[in-house]
Amino acid sequence: KIDACKRGDVTVKPSHVILLGSTVNITCSLKPRQGCFHYSRRNKLILYKFDRRINFHHGHSLNSQVTGLPLGTTLFVCKLACINSDEIQICGAEIFVGVAPEQPQNLSCIQKGEQGTVACTWERGRDTHLYTEYTLQLSGPKNLTWQKQCKDIYCDYLDFGINLTPESPESNFTAKVTAVNSLGSSSSLPSTFTFLDIVRPLPPWDIRIKFQKASVSRCTLYWRDEGLVLLNRLRYRPSNSRLWNMVNVTKAKGRHDLLDLKPFTEYEFQISSKLHLYKGSWSDWSESLRAQTPEEEPTGMLDVWYMKRHIDYSRQQISLFWKNLSVSEARGKILHYQVTLQELTGGKAMTQNITGHTSWTTVIPRTGNWAVAVSAANSKGSSLPTRINIMNLCEAGLLAPRQVSANSEGMDNILVTWQPPRKDPSAVQEYVVEWRELHPGGDTQVPLNWLRSRPYNVSALISENIKSYICYEIRVYALSGDQGGCSSILGNSKHKAPLSGPHINAITEEKGSILISWNSIPVQEQMGCLLHYRIYWKERDSNSQPQLCEIPYRVSQNSHPINSLQPRVTYVLWMTALTAAGESSHGNEREFCLQGKAN
């Protein structure tokens, strides 16, 4: 065996283990004939704290008093320095600085499940920084005792490995933990308990749910529990919710009826158990059961709106639109919508099932009184039909809302305001605000949006399907019985100057004046609602300011006459467009020379 300290020794007094704040004496002494050759008086013993010199002495031994050592471990090393040679390592020693253990606090014991074993936890108090041994003792009836030790540096948990049984559930047991290290010992206060106090049941398992006759109103939750369980608590919530519904039940025997579940909703269920009304603790929550409740027939009614379009003298196109039911109203997966169209006087009726759409278009005669009914169907049944009489929504001029305005209200919102119609305002049953993207061709495929407003409201904030830099055609309808009046306006939530001007595609001469025709600016370049077009013209090769004509914007207009040009003079013409934010750049330039006679 190699002797690491063959040249000398390091001794520590009073001990290698000291209380924080204490002083230690460290002695380094050379063994016989281990000093510097020839010059033993020249022995220079040096004491290092780790690698930092703290003391030295000439001779065969060195004594050093050390104070102020920190908590934890410090390594001291003694070396010998001789003339003309490297320092020689003599020996080393560790000193451990710590404190006596504090009294362990909050000792508590638990047995997980009726077949589990007793385990206790406690709070150690402040770190001793020393090797500390913990002994846990349990004493029970008939002088029975059990003991377990733990030598882990951070010991605050021990399992006795014994199982308490329910034969005498009221028998008392007492636990105590004692901490011991080189500087002292301390014991916890005793903790006394019975079987019922410390047994924490295992969480329930094998959780199932049954819906009798596939109905949400006849729902039973089943589970399995340990034999002695008396109480259960159930918690459940829709999977998309953070709030739990809680139910406490006694002597449930592994089943409970739930009466307030919503149809067609995924729920999460958990159960916990307890052995006694006021003793012991609740088990952990069981693993979650996730289950979807069955469908029920839809409630509520569809919000239906429509549009009429004249085709010819005998036919009209009806486009029906409806909004999806809310999840709580649909109460299942909507399989189809049933649309019934009926001529009220002749009683002719046509029914159609629509899947995958929330709109329907058909052509009907312009004569007769027509009504539609729309309902939503899932696997369990249909909602109540929404019935609408088809009328000319804008026929009653006296019902037209007045002073309609549309103003941007923050990002992607438009505030629509109006005044009640001149005709008795109290006759209005409701207002409908309708909006759709403005397309110059009057495209009927453009999605329609609407909202309903109570008769006492004179404003509505529209935000659904509103995009920046897009112009919307907004209509406000006032409905009264089988009559309606409407007013319209253009509006946008955000605008800037158009990106381009109109493209002049033709200039024709008519009776001494000219007719300018242009192509509309593409919708994506309009950047909001157009207010005006400007037509500019000036003589070719002239440096004079151009003349201009400003035309109010109308959706369908794409030509305009100008009659102030001189004959046989060549002009250059171009156009711009304006929104409330400014004027576009020039469109294309066209030259034209009027051939007519001079006045």
Epitope: A4, D51, G72, T73, L75, V77, Q89, E94
Partner: nanobody
């Protein structure tokens, strides 16, 4: 008393492998960084590798001359430090010894508190 005893040295051919061990006793081992040094004949000590205090997942450091060939590890339960040496070269010939050290280990020689006597490694064909 603090003691570090190296073993595992010997004669090996170039390209061969050796595993050195350093058994610690008389001190707590776990709270200290540990290093391997080597000293070739007629030369001063050269730091080879170090491992942080604590578990086997402690950070490791290597001199450029041995990077990718040597691996340092420790087993705190056995109070033992290891150096696995592969692809050995004649210039690796030296006395290898372990030491209780403190960093840094990047650009300067680490601080040494205590070292073992060493074990001879000879790489020769």
């Amino acid at each position: 008393q603090v003691q570090l005893v190296e073993s595992g040295g010997g004669l090996v051919q170039p390209g061969g492998s050796l595993r050195l061990s350093c058994a610690a006793s008389g001190f707590t081992f776990e709270p200290y960084d540990m290093s391997w040094f080597r000293q070739a004949p007629g030369k001063g000590p050269e730091w080879v590798s170090a491992i942080d205090k604590g578990g086997g997942a402690g950070a490791t450091y290597y001199a450029d001359s041995v990077k990718g060939r040597f691996t340092i590890s420790r087993d705190n339960a056995k109070k033992t430090l290891y150096l696995q040496m592969k692809s050995l070269k004649p210039e690796d010939t030296a006395v290898y010894y372990c030491a209780i050290t403190a960093g840094p280990y990047s650009d300067s020689t680490p601080r040494v508190a205590y070292r073992g006597e060493g074990t001879q490694v000879t790489v020769s064909s």
